[in-house]
């Protein structure tokens, strides 16, 4: 004989793959006080209990650990407890109360659990700017996980050397010790939830601020084709008259400033140009010598110079007759 | 058991293409970061390429970026490496590695291999 | 990128020996290295990791050591099983680069 109950709530919960859910249940009102039993939590049309306090009942193994029936029948608790979810368990649960002394037991309306695929994603934390050759903490974490479920598996994946920091159930941290090289490369942070066979990642950019590590000058002498030099470069024959245009790019993280300087400039020398570009329309004996440009950065500066000779046409050089 | 099983490997022209592919079995897949890595006839060992546990990043080195891709698909536990404009230097012995699961870049299992050759 | 140099190229021991591979990385890879032993036909097996930890099922023969640039690997009381050809491997940032190998023989 079988007493009918009203589960107080929703008749359907949902949660996503990995995470955990509570179904709230409350014993019936008319339950006696003298009433001693069993609770069991069964899967609609399986006759397997899913959870139970029951010593002597096997429960089904696909929910074992992962399901739990909260007891306690002085607060009228019959709630149960789902971590760790699993597409599978996408089902119709009902609660029932036997008693081997009692000759009727009670049972519950149905209550629908909707698993859904998981969307929350991991967050990638970074404090503050991440500078060449100096260590950072990165956190990536979780959240949204619930501490009762099978901690989260974290994986890292950077181009930048790194080591592991400290772990808790929610999160991972890892060391990064950039270089200029790791700048705009891509930094993955994984969480697998192995009680689910989920996983999902987060990828971000690096930002990597770093010192210009190199200067090159182009060169753009009338109408022939440009060419670069990479290091100092002691004499550059020019033909005089010639328009010289020079251009000078750096890298580093934020941009280096580019400015040009006529000789080897002291740190205070005034530029001649505040850009990386310098245009010398007609080159004549003023022009003669050193040009410098120096790229200007909060981490460091670099400097290039190229040396002018310049080659004097005949005729302007002749004297009148 | 965990196990990686290379296969594609064969011989083919410089500037040609090839594909090859790794199926894992015996552990968690979409877990782990896996790469190629390659032994020349010189035996000397090459880091290739690698990819995260969910396919959304990527590394290479120089000698082989822009040339060759690689990719996973979880649902398969299989890895690609899709190999175009071959050059006779990437004739090697090709293995497919698994990544130690967490952050470094050791590589804690590997398959057998399988033979690239590129000779016209 | 990070060279690794791996000295002797090749070595001829006798079982129950004790030998010492050497690697030397061109900068400081804060202990960011592996060893892999591999057999003729076969391939490699991770022996050591983060340049000291012994991976599972290792022999206690084997044990790894050094800091900063350099690192070795030692080999106790060689067994038979033990020729092969031994590599070193920087995990310090990409790009991943390889000793070139030492080579055991028996002598």
């Known amino acids: 004989q079988e007493r009918r109950f009203q589960l107080e709530g929703p008749e359907s919960l949902t949660v996503q793959e990995g995470l955990c859910v509570l179904v709230p249940c409350r014993l019936p009102t008319t339950l006696p006080a003298s009433y001693y039993g069993y609770g069991y939590w069964f899967l609609e049309g399986a006759d397997v209990p899913v959870a139970t306090n029951d010593p002597d009942e096997e429960v089904q193994e696909e929910t074992r650990g992962r399901f739990h029936l909260l007891w306690d029948p002085r607060r009228k608790n019959c709630s149960l407890s789902i971590r760790d979810a699993r597409r599978r368990d996408n089902a119709a649960y009902f609660f029932r109360l036997k008693s081997k002394w009692m000759k009727y037991g009670y049972t519950s309306s149905k209550l629908s659990v909707r698993v859904m695929a998981l969307t929350h994603r991991p967050n990638i934390s970074i404090p503050g700017t991440l500078e060449s050759g100096h260590p950072s903490n990165l956190t990536c974490s979780v959240p949204w996980v619930c501490e009762q479920g099978t901690p989260p598996i974290f994986s890292w994946m950077s181009a930048a050397p790194t080591s592991l920091g400290p772990r808790t159930t929610q999160s991972s941290v890892l060391t990064i010790t950039p270089r200029p090289q790791d700048h705009s490369t891509n930094l993955t942070c994984q969480v697998t939830f192995p009680g689910a066979g989920v996983t999902m990642e987060r990828t971000i950019q690096l930002n990597v601020s770093y010192a210009p590590q190199k200067v090159a000058i182009s060169i753009f002498q009338g109408n022939s084709a440009a060419f670069k030099i990479l290091q100092n470069t002691s004499s550059l024959p020019v033909l005089e008259g010639q328009a010289l245009r020079l251009l000078c790019d750096a890298d580093g993280n934020p941009p280096a400033h580019l400015s040009w300087f006529q000789g080897f400039p002291a740190l205070n020398a005034t530029p001649i140009s505040n850009t990386g570009v310098l245009e010398l329309p007609q080159v004549g004996s003023a022009e003669e010598g050193d040009f410098t440009c120096r790229a200007q950065h909060p981490l460091g500066s670099l400097q290039i110079s190229l040396s002018l000779f310049v080659h004097w046409k005949p005729e302007g050089r002749a004297g009148g007759v | 058991e965990v196990m990686l099983v290379e296969s594609g490997g064969g011989l083919v022209k410089p500037g040609g293409s090839l594909k090859l592919s790794c199926a894992a079995s015996?552990?968690?897949?979409?877990?782990?970061?896996m790469s190629w890595v390659r032994q020349t006839p010189e035996k000397r060992l090459e880091w290739v390429a690698s990819?995260?546990?969910?396919?959304?990043?990527?590394y290479y080195p120089d000698s082989v970026k822009g040339r060759f891709t690689i990719s996973r698909d979880n649902a398969k536990n299989t890895l690609y490496l899709q190999m175009s404009s071959l050059r006779s230097e990437d004739t090697a012995l090709y293995y497919c590695a698994r990544r130690e699961v967490v952050v470094y870049w050791y590589f804690d299992v590997w398959g057998t291999g399988t033979t690239v050759t590129v000779s016209s | 990128d990070i060279q690794m140099t791996q000295s002797p190229a090749s070595l001829s021991v006798s079982v129950g020996e004790t030998v010492t591979i050497t690697c030397r990385a061109s900068e400081n890879i804060y202990s960011n290295l592996a060893w892999y032993q591999q057999k003729q036909g076969k391939s490699p097996q991770l022996l050591v990791f983060?340049?000291?930890n012994l991976a599972d099922g290792v022999p206690s023969r084997f044990g790894g050591s050094g800091s900063g640039t350099q690192y070795s690997l030692k080999i106790n009381s060689l067994q038979s099983e033990d020729f092969g050809t031994y590599y070193c491997?920087?995990?310090?940032?990409?790009?991943?680069?390889f000793g070139a190998g030492t080579k055991l023989e028996l002598k």
């Open positions: 015996g552990f968690s897949f979409s877990t782990y970061v």
């Open positions: 990819i995260s546990g969910g396919g959304s990043n990527t």
């Open positions: 983060s340049a000291k």
């Open positions: 491997q920087h995990f310090w940032g990409t790009p991943l680069t």
